[in-house]
Amino acid sequence: DSSKWVFEHPETLYAWEGACVWIPCTYRALDGDLESFILFHNPEYNKNTSKFDGTRLYESTKDGKVPSEQKRVQFLGDKNKNCTLSIHPVHLNDSGQLGLRMESKTEKWMERIHLNVSERPFPPHIQLPPEIQESQEVTLTCLLNFSCYGYPIQLQWLLEGVPMRQAAVTSTSLTIKSVFTRSELKFSPQWSHHGKIVTCQLQDADGKFLSNDTVQLNVKHTPKLEIKVTPSDAIVREGDSVTMTCEVSSSNPEYTTVSWLKDGTSLKKQNTFTLNLREVTKDQSGKYCCQVSNDVGPGRSEEVFLQVQYAPEPSTVQILHSPAVEGSQVEFLCMSLANPLPTNYTWYHNGKEMQGRTEEKVHIPKILPWHAGTYSCVAENILGTGQRGPGAELDVQYPPKKVTTVIQNPMPIREGDTVTLSCNYNSSNPSVTRYEWKPHGAWEEPSLGVLKIQNVGWDNTTIACAACNSWCSWASPVALNVQYAPRDVRVRKIKPLSEIHSGNSVSLQCDFSSSHPKEVQFFWEKNGRLLGKESQLNFDSISPEDAGSYSCWVNNSIGQTASKAWTLEVLYAPRRLRVSMSPGDQVMEGKSATLTCESDANPPVSHYTWFDWNNQSLPYHSQKLRLEPVKVQHSGAYWCQGTNSVGKGRSPLSTLTVYYSPETIGRR
């Protein structure tokens, strides 16, 4: 309706003597700003005066007059939107109707708000979910229709009068829609909380009690059970009787059915609170419990472990591990059902008692072939001795033993012979399946464990074989002791250490790398001529004529071997020098004369020097001296000198005659 002022605020506000009231309020005037505001207590309209009568708690006018009551009552609003009020402290006689008389320039309005002030603080209200089940988290809510800025309060939770450990979340609302204080507590109730009293206590800021609300918890839970057994230790012997009783200590709602379980499986036709077991057998040993159900679900008691004692049963042996490898460790385990557990064991190896072995386990740290065989045991407890079972077989595996390589040939063996060897062994588990030979070669194996070496090499020194099952066992190498002719025969210069110069003392050595047999003879030859029969060939003073190709031979009873030809080079200074002349030793003037220095030298001549008849050196360094054009004055004796790294040599004089040409003679 557009002819009304629009207000929003809580319809009724609640408080108690001495507290305060905070009234959240908003409005919208019909026209313009608020010019006058009066807060009435229980206003009544006077038709005669056309005004409202009643106690004026607050007044705000144009002239600005404010009654003394204004200190207690405050208008916290404004001229167009906010109409919030505060009364602090609030009194019992403030209960009733509050009238907000609003006037603008042209319009007037009376807005009514209910105020309910009680003599004492009113209790909060606890809200519970419709159903509470054990171990399921629930939220407990405590609500109080009160909140005021000037009067702080707190809500505390108690269980059976004791503050609850869980943290509560407190919230307040002071809005135009609602005014309240609320505390929420998240809580996982256990079955033991059933029937307990929960209190929400209202306290002032100092923790002083103001009021409270209480509820009794109704926690739905499965039946809670206790089991009792006779005899109390639940240890009996075969043939004894046992009684078990199931007691319900709590159930909400009431239980409906009872049953018994053994090792988690339901026992048929056992639906009473007592379980009677007569003349028990060992099969009845196990874990027993009772189960009682209600609408929430089944509840189980703790388990009772019933032990029916009996003498050991026939034993079996478990081997870790068989087959066992020689040198490894093995453990034997004697397995025999018995209650109580066996206290003593007797062990047997191949039917013979093993002395000093009385434990459930036998450990052999290092297995040997003789440990193989059948192992059995007997178990013993306080009720008697069991029977010996069938036993278990230990298989001990090991590499082939005492492997040997045997040469089948007559001795001695010569290079090029065919050699046959066999590989023998003493024992093996598992059986030998293959053989290996060292060193590897392109050799025949005509049958298992036999090796044939065709054309045996001089360097086939030793052979070893291995017999193999899962492992290979190598024999000690056997020496073939192959006999052969001398090898790697070569000529070696012993002296001089450097190059050989004419006149040096020279020694050549005939070397060889090996010979079998070791007794040898030597032969030296040059150009097919025998020179000596020693290991060394000696020259006291070598001459250029000794240069040439030398070989030595070494022989033994198997054969003879020659060295590669070795070239003996003798270095010597230039010798046999002579000057030759071209075209001859008589040349006509104006022509060309070439003088050549001929020599024998090793190494060849590296440098030539030419001299005239007065031993004056000419500035030429080649083997040839060319005079062009030749003059009569050039007539005379010339000689040359040759130089190499060993030394110098000189030629005898050679005479060049230069004669006049016919032209010169004609001019004279």
Epitope: H607, N614, S617, H621, S622, Q623, R626, K631, Q633, H634
Partner: antibody, heavy 124, light 111 residues
Framework: EVQLQQSGPGLVKPSQTLSLTCAIS??????????WNWIRQSPSRGLEWLGR?????????DYVGSVKSRITINPDTSKNQFSLQLNSVTPEDTAVYYC??????????????WGQGTTVTVSS | QSALTQPASVSGSPGQSITISCTGS?????????VSWYQQHPGNAPKLIIH???NRPSGVFDRFSVSQSGNTASLTISGLQAEDEADYYC???????????FGTGTKVTVL
Amino acid sequence: EVQLQQSGPGLVKPSQTLSLTCAISGDSVSNNNAAWNWIRQSPSRGLEWLGRTYHRSTWYNDYVGSVKSRITINPDTSKNQFSLQLNSVTPEDTAVYYCARETDYGDYGAFDIWGQGTTVTVSS
Amino acid sequence: QSALTQPASVSGSPGQSITISCTGSRNDIGAYESVSWYQQHPGNAPKLIIHGVNNRPSGVFDRFSVSQSGNTASLTISGLQAEDEADYYCSSHTTTSTLYVFGTGTKVTVL
């Protein structure tokens, strides 16, 4: 101190004769341990040995094959000098001409003293 | 008789070492240990700096050294200096009637 002083014309016409003289001071043209050489240098041919004269028990001459038919090197003992004559010149003979002493160093000779050089241009 | 072969140019910074090669044949360098090396500054006559197996005329620094292997000779200038900037020529005796042969020349630049 041995010095070689060159003289002679810088311009020669083609087909004429190029004549240069090298005067020796501090040494003798008859020195039995020296030889007296002519060497030329041009951008196209680089350094080129032409020939020499020297005295041992008598006088000797050596010439490079490429100019053997046109060259004469003569000693002049009275003036202690030696000369170069190159006949029938062509523009190819344009070069800087040097005289040089050759002395043995150990077993072999080298040109240890050089003249100042004469630039000869063959042109008509 | 063809000329001995040298690199056209070689350069180096002051204080560095440089090497100039000179390659001939078995008729010249290969036949004699007689290679001579000459230095020529622009406008001047060549000057003998080293001959044969490290024979130096008086007044020539020992920064200049030579080596020879087969048909190739080499000149090494160590501790390069500004005044070393010049043309360098090698020369050898020959076994032919051309008694002497020179190298093509190498221009050395000091950076």
